[in-house]
């Protein structure tokens, strides 16, 4: 969490941002809140990015003002116009690109004063893994697949029964470049698995950590997946 205060001139207002990550090719949110004003027409929201000459986005007098927008962000940004009045200056970024990563500034002007806060935005690709029993294999084998990751993640297998065991000798992980030549499909195979055990396939890079669990018994197979974004710090 980053909390920024205003500078010179009028009184300062508090602006708060939260570091976040964007999944390339999908839409992302750059979070920013501020002390609200009673009049929408008095609120100016400006988003800037380090390394970019023009503005990322500008909202003033109750509407988007895009004449100063940098071409890099054209057609890809929007604020939540109906929530500005309650102090939400968050930016929706469409079709996140790898190059969108960097330092952003949320700059606010209201009748109470000015304030700003920086936000670190990471970009990459992350997806939920799915673990399945590979019935085609000669021995009991599990196959963990996740369709989109970037940068290249690490894959670690764990088991509930053999806690702390190192499965690197009995697993094989491959990374296959997807058609857009950035993200990769992750496939990891675990050999010599035993029945009545829960196995976890953990995929992690510096942006996200995802886990796919599978519990194999003689009568059923249970699966569970979850994904967690790393380093979500507020400013």
């Amino acid at each position: 969490l980053i909390i920024g205060f205003g500078i010179s001139g009028r009184h300062s207002i508090t602006v708060t941002t939260v570091a976040s990550a964007g999944n390339i090719g999908e839409d992302g949110i750059l979070s920013c809140t501020f002390e609200p004003d009673i009049k929408l027409s008095d609120i100016v929201i400006q988003w800037l990015k380090e390394g970019v000459l023009g503005l990322v986005h500008e909202f003033k007098e109750g509407k988007d003002e895009l004449s100063e927008q940098d071409e890099m962000f054209r057609g890809r940004t929007a604020v939540f116009a109906d929530q500005v009045i309650v102090g939400n200056a968050s930016l929706r970024l469409k079709n996140v690109q790898l190059t969108d990563a960097g330092t952003y500034k949320c700059y606010i002007i209201t009748s109470k004063g000015k304030g700003n806060a920086n936000l670190e935005y990471k970009t990459g690709a992350f997806s939920m893994p799915e673990v399945n029993v590979d019935y085609n294999a000669s021995s009991e084998t599990l196959r963990c697949e996740a369709p989109r990751w970037f940068p290249q993640p690490t894959v670690v297998w764990a088991s509930q029964v053999d806690q702390g065991a190192n499965f690197s000798e009995v697993s094989n992980t491959s990374f296959e470049l997807n058609s857009e030549n950035v993200t990769m499909k992750v496939v990891s195979v675990l050999y010599n698995v035993t029945i009545n055990n829960t196995y976890s396939c953990m995929i992690e890079n510096d942006i996200a950590k995802a886990t796919g669990d599978i519990k194999v018994t003689e009568s059923e197979i249970k699966r569970r997946s979850h994904l967690q974004l790393l380093n979500s710090k507020a400013s």
């Epitope: 800037l48 895009l66 004449s67 054209r74 500034k105 002007i109």
Partner: antibody, heavy 115, light 113 residues
Framework: QVQLVQSGAEVKKPGSSVKVSCKAS????????INWVRQAPGQGLEWMGG????????RYAQKFQGRVTITADESTSTAYMELSSLRSEDTAVYYC????????WGQGTLVTVSS | DIVMTQSPDSLAVSLGERATINCKSS????????????LAWYQQKPGQPPKLLIY???TRESGVPDRFSGSGSGTDFTLTISSLQAEDVAVYYC?????????FGQGTRLEIK
């Protein structure tokens, strides 16, 4: 009301450098780009480059790359344009202009390059 | 870079008459998603910096008299002064702000006939 006030006229020798300043008042200095545009005598307008004062990010027209340096000092709301290796064809009026859409302009600074 | 070409280079029009200046861009400055043309017109009087008249190809800047109007889309644009006044004698420039580097037309000098 936004005002941009530039430094005074300069006479320079070929091969030397010139540094022109542009001080902003009456508005938010840091968030809009400050651009530099030059106009040779009797000629048109030519964009040289610009800077985002908040982050110090500068972009230059290819023609001036390596010869121009644009900087900004947030504390004094002042932008600077330095042009090096001056030649006679650099004799021009140099303007600072605020924003990608140049809504506000400085009064211009005449730089004369003569031996 | 986008090249902006204005025509004519100079123009003489009688007071009260219509003046028309054309501007052509080497590539489209229309962004289809928002249907906006990133094209502006400036007026420059002798010894003064340019003054923004029109942006988004047809939106008048605040304080600009309504005798000034802009039209066109894509690559072809026009600045029209419906009834020329003595104070309109100046050089007029079109500018694209669609991409960096920002580029200007070579200018059109408008005089009274």
């Amino acid at each position: 009301q936004v005002q941009l006030v530039q430094s005074g006229a300069e006479v320079k020798k070929p091969g030397s450098s010139v540094k022109v300043s542009c001080k902003a008042s009456g508005g938010t200095f840091s968030t809009y780009a400050i651009n530099w545009v030059r106009q040779a005598p009797g000629q048109g307008l030519e964009w040289m480059g610009g800077i985002n004062p908040m982050f110090g990010t500068a972009r230059y027209a290819q023609k001036f790359q390596g010869r121009v340096t644009i900087t900004a000092d947030e504390s004094t709301s002042t932008a600077y344009m330095e042009l090096s290796s001056l030649r006679s064809e650099d004799t021009a009026v140099y303007y600072c202009a605020r924003g990608r859409l140049h809504r506000h302009w400085g009064q211009g600074t005449l730089v004369t390059v003569s031996s | 870079d986008i090249v902006m070409t204005q025509s004519p280079d100079s123009l003489a029009v009688s007071l009260g008459e219509r003046a028309t200046i054309n501007c052509k861009s080497s590539q489209s400055v229309l962004y289809s998603s928002n249907n906006k043309n990133y094209l502006a017109w400036y007026q420059q009087k002798p010894g003064q910096p340019p003054k923004l008249l029109i942006y988004w190809a047809s939106t008048r800047e605040s304080g600009v008299p309504d005798r000034f109007s802009g039209s066109g889309s894509g690559t072809d644009f026009t600045l029209t002064i419906s009834s020329l006044q003595a104070e309109d004698v100046a050089v007029y420039y079109c500018q694209q702000y669609y991409t960096t580097p920002i580029t200007f037309g070579q200018g059109t000098r408008l005089e009274i006939k």
